[in-house]
């Protein structure tokens, strides 16, 4: 079961996998959660009746019953895995740590005003895992306002020491909060010729991919598939990293596959979650459990159900055997991969789905589109809300998007004449506005949150959000869009649309079916153009047809313009003005969301 | 079932004030706008203004803004309109409707208040 | 202000004849219209919301329709029980605004 609380001055016994150095009890239990076996640990505080050694020592432990006995001992604070519960993990850890001193390899050293200044230089460093800072208190005057940057094998500290007069912290590539370029592109028949820090066994590249992007120090990977000339090669993944942080070499090789790893783009691409099926394909491993199954489905259901099971192998049954059964193999490794892959057998494997939850929500597949036509179907855009007032009677006022469980990002002139949140009432899961009756459950709003420096649309900073009373429960109707990663500036998006419940002429009335309008993007550059009057600025984005006919308008403001991109879709504009509905030569403008991810993430990760 | 308990009758002086009452109940008091409207003897139906109980916001109309004050009491579910520097105008019945889902679904039953020297 | 003109102000007509009171808006207040029935010495009663949905409870001869500025109300078959004075009114934007009322009598 799920045991989210600590136990203070309590040690577990035996079980132990590793040893890591941590700051806090709450990251060690954060690390245990990530670490591919780990179920339990025993972190020790600083503390006089301790040998400073110890301190900030995060024991990594496992047990097949799950649990192991429990020692008093003070200074000592134990606790399970997340592995164990449901809910959202993330790695992201925004503390610092006063008078603490991480060590690593201290790679760069350069001057900083401050500390936040100097953990945005490690989140941007892509080689940084966590940093040290020396205040401008700090004894030595040479060594004030010092910013180390530090890496390690692990991503964990070496060692962990009290220093006054420093802090320490991580980098925030974890919170999405890094500019360093998201690279999704596998290269096919490539090799990077660069120093390998690790390698598992893969059953194909994108995977492969996911691994580097979690392992601390690989900055990119080469994968030799399963028809690699070297048979004892085949299927393996090697995790690299250079100095320069990008591949020194390159080389034409047939049935290799190269790529980077994916840790700028983690918040809108799933990097933990292995959902695919490989089919004649058997994964060896430590075997935990052998048990009946109907279908690999199943057997993928019993392990991820199993919080030690990390990947599994079914052989579908002989004809009339065991009720049609096969049986499903539940395994497990050292690091979570298989330790080999074999093919031509007729088994069927695959992976837990248990750390899916460890990815972003938005990153999950939602159910194919209908192609054409403009009124959508249930489902078909789970992200987007109709934001109702009651003021002077019940209506639709807004659209916005679901960008987490208790957050709606819409725009900021929306909210002209709302003099409070209580009057608002946000309806998720709608595809008919005549859906929606005096008992239908809404959200309630808890808080307006417009941009600081918004005056006008046209103007810009046209970005509120909203942070509901409740939580929203994801189904299939309901879920989260991804926000786009900063290292996706230069993506160019090939499939956006805008949705909402607007008029579908100027002069008409919000329509009761949510419409669907496929629009290209186009560039600033000739956006300005179309609007000689305005200032088009990089914190916005256009879309439009040149000879109009399909576009947002008077009652979409709010809602998203979404983009798939890599099978996932991501909240790239938020509607906001344009001259008239649908014109020739006037594209829609939308609030340029990718400029806001700062913003949206200090207002909703704030204490 | 809904309903709005509106105050008795009300005589009073030019230049006085006058504080109005309208019980709410059989419904969630503090999620829907209270209007206020008036009807002089023989007259159509003119709006005075609204209040959300669970914020305390208020619309009113420009004829009324300086004279009318509408608050409300969530602890009792009770709405108030306080008209003040009252004349022969103002005699007239005021009614509390709640302003439901779509329309004004539910009216008190009126309070009839006439302004004589 | 949108003012809502309704007309005729009184009209006269027999049991079981189809009667029909329009509303003129000044501006387009989309469906955002209400139809209200009152009775003497007694408050107003809902009839009709959205320019066109009926009301719980109210009788099927009762009729809404239009947009954007014109409306009508109509009674399909006049009952005795109808006597009322009947307003309209827009819920579109404040001020909130009400026709000034049309007095129906049975000849």
């Known amino acids: 079961e799920c045991v989210t609380q600590l136990l203070k001055d309590t040690c577990f016994e035996g079980g132990d996998i590793t040893t890591v150095f941590t700051p806090s009890a709450k990251y060690c239990q954060v690390v245990c959660t990530y670490h591919p076996r780990c179920l339990l640990f025993t972190f020790t505080a600083e503390s006089p009746s301790e040998d400073p050694t110890r301190w900030f020592t995060c024991v990594l432990k496992d047990s097949v019953t799950e649990t192991l006995p429990r020692v008093n001992r003070t200074a000592a604070i134990s606790g399970y895995s997340f592995k164990q519960c449901s809910h959202q993990i993330s790695a992201c850890n925004k503390d610092i740590y006063v008078d603490l001193d991480m060590k690593g390899i201290n790679y760069n050293s350069s001057v900083a005003k401050s500390a936040q200044e100097c953990q945005e230089r490690c989140t941007d460093d892509v080689h940084c895992h966590f940093f040290t800072y020396a205040t401008r208190q700090f004894p030595s005057l040479e060594h004030r306002n010092i910013c180390l940057l530090k890496h390690t094998q692990t991503g964990t500290p070496t060692r962990i020491t009290k220093l006054d007069k420093v802090v320490s912290g991580f980098s925030l590539k974890s919170c999405a909060l890094s500019n360093l370029a998201c690279i999704r592109d596998i290269f096919p028949n490539t090799v990077f010729a660069d120093s390998n820090i690790d390698s598992v066994m893969a059953p194909d590249a994108f995977v492969c991919g996911r691994i580097c992007t979690h392992h601390p120090g690989c900055l990119f990977f080469t994968f030799f598939s399963q028809e690699w000339p070297k048979e004892s090669q085949r299927n393996l993944c090697l995790l690299k990293t250079s100095e320069s942080g990008l591949p020194s070499t390159r080389i034409k090789k047939s049935k290799a596959l190269s790529g980077f790893s994916l840790q700028s783009c983690r918040h809108s691409i799933p990097v933990f979650c292995h959902s695919s099926f490989y089919h004649d394909t058997d994964f060896l491993g430590e075997e935990l459990d052998i048990v009946a199954a109907k279908s690999h489905e199943a057997c993928q259901k019993l392990c991820t159900n199993a919080v030690r099971c990390q990947f599994f192998t079914y052989t579908p049954a002989q004809a009339s055997c065991n009720e049609g059964k096969g049986k499903c193999y539940l395994k497990l490794s050292s690091n979570g991969s298989p330790t080999k892959i074999l093919h031509g057998r007729g088994g069927i494997s695959g992976y837990t789905l248990r750390l899916c939850k460890m990815d972003n929500e938005c990153t999950t597949k939602i159910k194919p589109r209908i192609v054409g036509g403009t009124a959508s179907v249930r489902g078909e855009w789970p992200w987007q809300v109709t934001l109702h007032t009651t003021s002077p009677t019940q209506r639709h006022l807004c659209g916005g998007s679901i960008i987490g469980n208790q957050w709606i990002l819409t725009a900021a002139h929306c909210f002209y004449g709302v003099e409070s949140p209580k009057i608002l009432r946000v309806y998720s899961g709608i595809l008919n506005q005549s859906e929606i009756k005096e008992d239908t459950s809404f959200f309630g709003v808890q808080e307006i949150i417009i941009h600081d420096q918004y005056k006008m649309a046209e103007s810009g900073y046209d970005i509120a959000l909203l942070k509901l009373e409740t939580t929203v429960n994801y189904t299939d109707s309901q879920r989260p869009i991804c926000l786009p990663s900063k290292g996706d500036r230069n993506v160019i998006y090939t499939d956006c649309w805008v949705t909402g419940w607007g008029y579908r002429k100027l002069r008409d009335k919000i329509q009761n079916t949510l419409q669907k309008a496929k629009i290209p993007l186009v560039t600033n550059e000739e956006c300005q153009k179309r609007y000689r009057g305005h200032k088009i600025t990089h914190k916005m984005i256009c879309a439009g047809y040149r000879e109009g006919g399909k576009d947002a308008c008077k009652g979409d403001s709010g809602g998203p313009l979404s983009c798939k991109h890599n099978e996932v879709w991501h909240l790239v504009g938020i509607t906001s003005w344009g001259e008239g509905c649908a014109q020739r030569e006037r594209p829609g403008v939308y609030t340029n969301v990718v400029e806001y991810v700062d913003w949206i993430l200090e207002k909703t990760q704030a204490v | 079932q809904v309903q709005l308990v509106q105050s008795g009758s009300e005589l009073k002086k030019p230049g006085a004030s006058v504080k109005l009452s309208c019980k709410a109940s059989?419904?969630?008091?503090?999620?829907?706008?209270m209007h206020w409207v008036k009807q002089a003897h023989g007259q159509g139906l003119e709006w005075i203004g609204n209040i959300y109980p669970d914020s305390d916001s208020t619309n009113y109309d420009e004829k009324f803004r300086t004279r009318a004050t509408l608050t409300a009491d969530t602890s009792t579910s009770t709405a108030y309109m306080h008209l003040s520097s009252l004349t022969s105008e103002d005699s007239a019945v005021y009614y509390c409707?709640?302003?439901?889902?779509?329309?004004?679904?539910?009216w008190g039953q009126g309070t009839s208040v006439t302004v004589s020297s | 202000n949108i003012v809502m003109t309704q007309s005729p102000s009184s009209l006269s007509a027999s049991v079981g004849d189809r009667v029909t009171i329009t509303c003129k808006a000044s501006e387009n207040v989309v469906t955002y219209v209400s139809w209200f029935q009152q009775k003497p010495g007694q408050a107003p009663k809902l009839l009709i919301y959205g320019a066109s949905n009926r009301y719980t409870g109210v009788p099927d001869r009762f009729t809404g329709s239009g947009s954007a500025t014109d409306f009508t109300l109509t009674i399909s078959s006049l009952q005795a029980e109808d006597v009322a004075d009947y307003h309209c009114g827009q819920s579109y934007s404040y001020p909130l605004t009400f026709g000034q009322g049309t007095k129906l009598e049975i000849k």
């Open positions: 409707t709640r302003m439901g889902f779509y329309a004004m679904d539910y």
């Open positions: 059989g419904y969630t008091f503090t999620r829907y706008w």
